[in-house]
């Protein structure tokens, strides 16, 4: 090899050992029979050398640094050449470094030809191994602007006072052009400006200078986004840290052409704007930090550019002004992550503040719109609390548990609507009366409706789930001792059509001691399956539940248990079941932890089934499933 550097070129070439590898044979640079491991060639020098091994790329790296001084004379602006040409250099991992020094008042602009650049974060690497590391200068301090790969959106980076650009090329890479040019600009009066150009839909992740370390104190950095007018941009902060400010406030400012409120100022913790049409600027402004405990300011954010969706021009009014203690959340439904670009899916408040989820609270009227390619990617969850604090006022009072029509008219599927029903302890209980009798969901007879009611205790310490119930069964009402949550959960978009089938009334009734009482009025046509609460986890310790089962005069009920034994093992107390005829009060008592369960029994009159648990040993829980079937009486036994 012969490397000759022109006298005034301000180029230095350094060949040195790379990261040490466990290669058996060492390798040397050979210059007139001398074996060395480092070679430095300066401007005006000409050196001939070879390598002592066949694969020097496994041992050595080469650095070519060009110092460009714009302080003392004119600056060589224009396309930057790779000097010396890559064809004259050994095939080693090579880094070309351009160090440009300029006056504070001079702006320098790096322009990147296609492909543009894509910023990468710490620990990331570029697929083709080609990286661009760019840093600036504040007085004597070097500031890392970022590390970039090819195939992105960054087209220009403007700085002042100097710039250092390092282009790293792997030994096998055929690239023979720098891919950028330098131009002079007037002072930019800030650390840097990064221009990001979108030709179509896409996303860009960008970071504050020095990321993940701290952004320089009291500095200003701007990103300019060039977005076709027919597309919409949304900003989301992926990661940020705030420093401890002594004076001024850390903030981001948006300049949105056409906005009457420019610049729009946001705190970093605010929801960032979305659904912006066309170009916009985003600036990060630091503060004067506390000298004793400065902390760090850093920001990593994503800009998502996509077509406006049909829904984005529609405004939906959600009137919660007459509601109390209610919150509605629109959020992404859980999905498997895919690796290809997926357009964002946002919900916007007043068309501007867009985010992937939004919570609306009662007491106000809200205007929302959607910026989303596919609204099935979102769902709604609503929570409403109905509480009674004064038992004298609430007793016998009823409330309808209905999904408000405003919510049903939204173009997003309702997932859960939860009512938290709270009563004064030991004073009142609750009764749920459905518009249509309910069926309890069991493996033997699953619900196949578009929605179900999930009923569970709302007492934090109590793990009691009464079950899942859907319209079209035999359960006429459910009485519960204390606080519960009733969740209407939808399972199919057809819920919108079936919404009329929903309807549950809750009333506050005098307090009773049993955990729950189910009133069952079986139909002659079908078998009713019933199971104890907390199925699969076992009825909680010392809990008592009853079923009030009606038998019409001309029918006989067959009560069947689906196991021979309950399987419960008591640590303390006894688990028992009482079957009591309501007319004669005659009762049978079964010890569930000892006796076998009764064989199928026939009941000519309405009867009670009461199950009371002991304190079971873990793993030996009380779970019972039974059925009631009506058949016509053949002989009148009255």
């Amino acid at each position: 090899f012969e490397i000759a550097l022109p006298r005034e070129s301000n180029i230095t070439v350094l060949i040195k050992l790379g990261t040490p590898t466990l290669l058996a044979k060492p390798c040397y640079i050979v210059i007139s029979k001398r074996h060395i491991t480092m070679l430095s060639i300066k401007s005006g020098e000409r050196i001939v050398f070879t390598f002592s091994c066949q694969s020097p790329e496994n041992h050595f790296v080469i650095e070519i640094q060009k110092n460009i001084d714009c302080m003392s004379g004119p600056c060589p602006f224009g396309e930057v050449q790779l000097q010396p040409s890559t064809s004259l250099l050994p095939t080693l991992n090579r880094t070309f470094i351009w160090d440009v020094k300029a006056h504070k008042s001079i702006g320098l602009e790096l322009q990147f030809s296609i492909p543009r650049l894509r910023q990468i974060g710490p620990g990331e690497s570029c697929p083709d191994g080609v990286t661009h590391s760019i840093s600036g200068r504040i007085d004597a301090t070097v500031v890392r602007i970022g590390t970039f790969c090819s195939n992105g959106t960054v087209s220009r980076i403007k700085m002042q006072e100097g710039v250092k650009m390092a282009l790293h090329l792997p030994w096998f890479h055929p690239r023979n052009v720098s891919g950028f040019s330098i131009a002079n600009r007037s002072s930019i009066k800030r650390l840097c400006i990064i221009e990001s150009v979108f030709e179509g839909e896409g996303s860009a992740t960008l970071m504050s200078a020095n990321y993940p370390e701290g952004f320089p104190e009291d500095e200003l950095m701007t990103w300019q986004f060039v977005v076709p007018a027919h597309l919409r941009a949304s900003v989301s902060f992926l990661n940020f840290n705030l420093s401890n400010c002594e004076r001024k406030e850390e903030r981001v400012e948006y300049y949105i052409p056409g906005s009457t409120t420019n610049p729009e100022v946001f705190k970093l913790e605010d929801k960032q704007p979305g659904n912006m049409a066309g170009n916009f600027n985003l600036s990060l402004q630091g503060c004067d930090q506390d000298a004793q405990s400065p902390g760090i300011l850093r920001l990593q954010f994503q800009v998502l550019v996509q077509h406006p969706q049909n829904e984005s021009n529609k405004i939906y009014v959600v009137d919660l002004s007459n509601e109390r203690a209610m919150s509605l959340t629109i959020e992404p439904r859980p999905v498997k992550q895919s690796r290809k670009f997926v357009p964002g899916c946002f919900v916007c408040l007043e068309s501007r503040t867009c985010s992937s989820n939004l919570t609306l609270t009662s007491g106000s009227k809200h205007k929302i719109s959607f910026l989303c390619d596919d609204l099935t990617r979102l769902w709604m969850n609503v929570e409403k609390t109905i509480s009674c604090t004064d038992h004298r006022y609430c007793q016998r009072k009823s409330y309808s548990l209905q999904v408000p029509s405003d919510i049903l008219h939204l173009p997003v599927e309702l997932h859960d609507f939860s009512w938290k029903l709270l009563v004064p302890k030991d004073r009142l209980s609750l009764v749920l009366v459905p518009a249509q009798k309910l069926q309890q969901h069991t493996h033997e007879k699953p619900c196949n409706t578009s929605f179900s009611y999930l009923v569970a205790s709302a007492i934090p310490s109590q793990d009691l789930y009464f079950g899942s119930f859907c319209p079209g069964g035999s359960i006429k009402q459910i009485q519960v001792k204390q606080n519960i949550s009733v969740t209407l959960r939808t399972f199919a978009p057809s819920f919108q059509q079936e919404a009329s089938r929903q309807g549950l009334t809750v009333s506050f009734i005098p307090y009773f001691k049993e955990e729950g009482v189910f009133t069952v009025t079986p139909d002659t046509k079908s078998k009713v399956y019933l199971r104890t609460p907390n199925w699969d986890r076992g009825l909680p310790s010392l809990t008592s539940v009853s079923w009030n089962i009606s038998v019409p005069r001309d029918q006989v009920a067959c009560l069947t248990f689906f196991k021979e034994r309950s399987g419960v093992v008591c640590q303390t107390g006894r688990a028992f079941m009482i079957i009591q005829e309501q007319r004669t009060r005659a009762e049978e008592i079964f010890s569930l932890d000892e006796d076998v369960l009764p064989k199928p029994s026939f009941h000519h009159h309405s009867f009670w089934v009461n199950i009371s648990n002991c304190s079971p040993t873990s793993g030996k829980q009380l779970d019972l499933l039974f059925s009631v079937t009506l058949t016509p009486r053949t002989v009148d036994l009255t």
């Epitope: 390598f51 790329e57 496994n58």
Partner: nanobody, 115 residues
Framework: QVQLVESGGGLVQAGGSLRLSCAAS????????MGWYRQAPGKQRELVVV???????NYADSVKGRFTISRDNAKNTVYLQMNSLKPEDTAVYYC?????????WGKGTQVTVSS
Amino acid sequence: QVQLVESGGGLVQAGGSLRLSCAASGSIFSGSAMGWYRQAPGKQRELVVVESSGGSTNYADSVKGRFTISRDNAKNTVYLQMNSLKPEDTAVYYCRGFYYGMGYWGKGTQVTVSS
């Protein structure tokens, strides 16, 4: 004098396969890194795949899973098996050998993929 001669190019329909060969002269071959590159009309020459002297390979994203590099040391030949070809694979394909820090190029072989 180190010489690399490519062969095996031609016209193939989209979805078809081709196998390119690169015969290397003498001592360059054994223990040297070898690679395949391509240049489409009006475009920069780009890496297809390179195999380092240690045997590790580096494929361009656009060919991963479709192209495979292999070599026969006894015949001083490196191969490029190209499957599921696409019209955008149309280019002149060059073989490159790395020897004592020098990168030697072959003269290239034309591959045309018709749709």
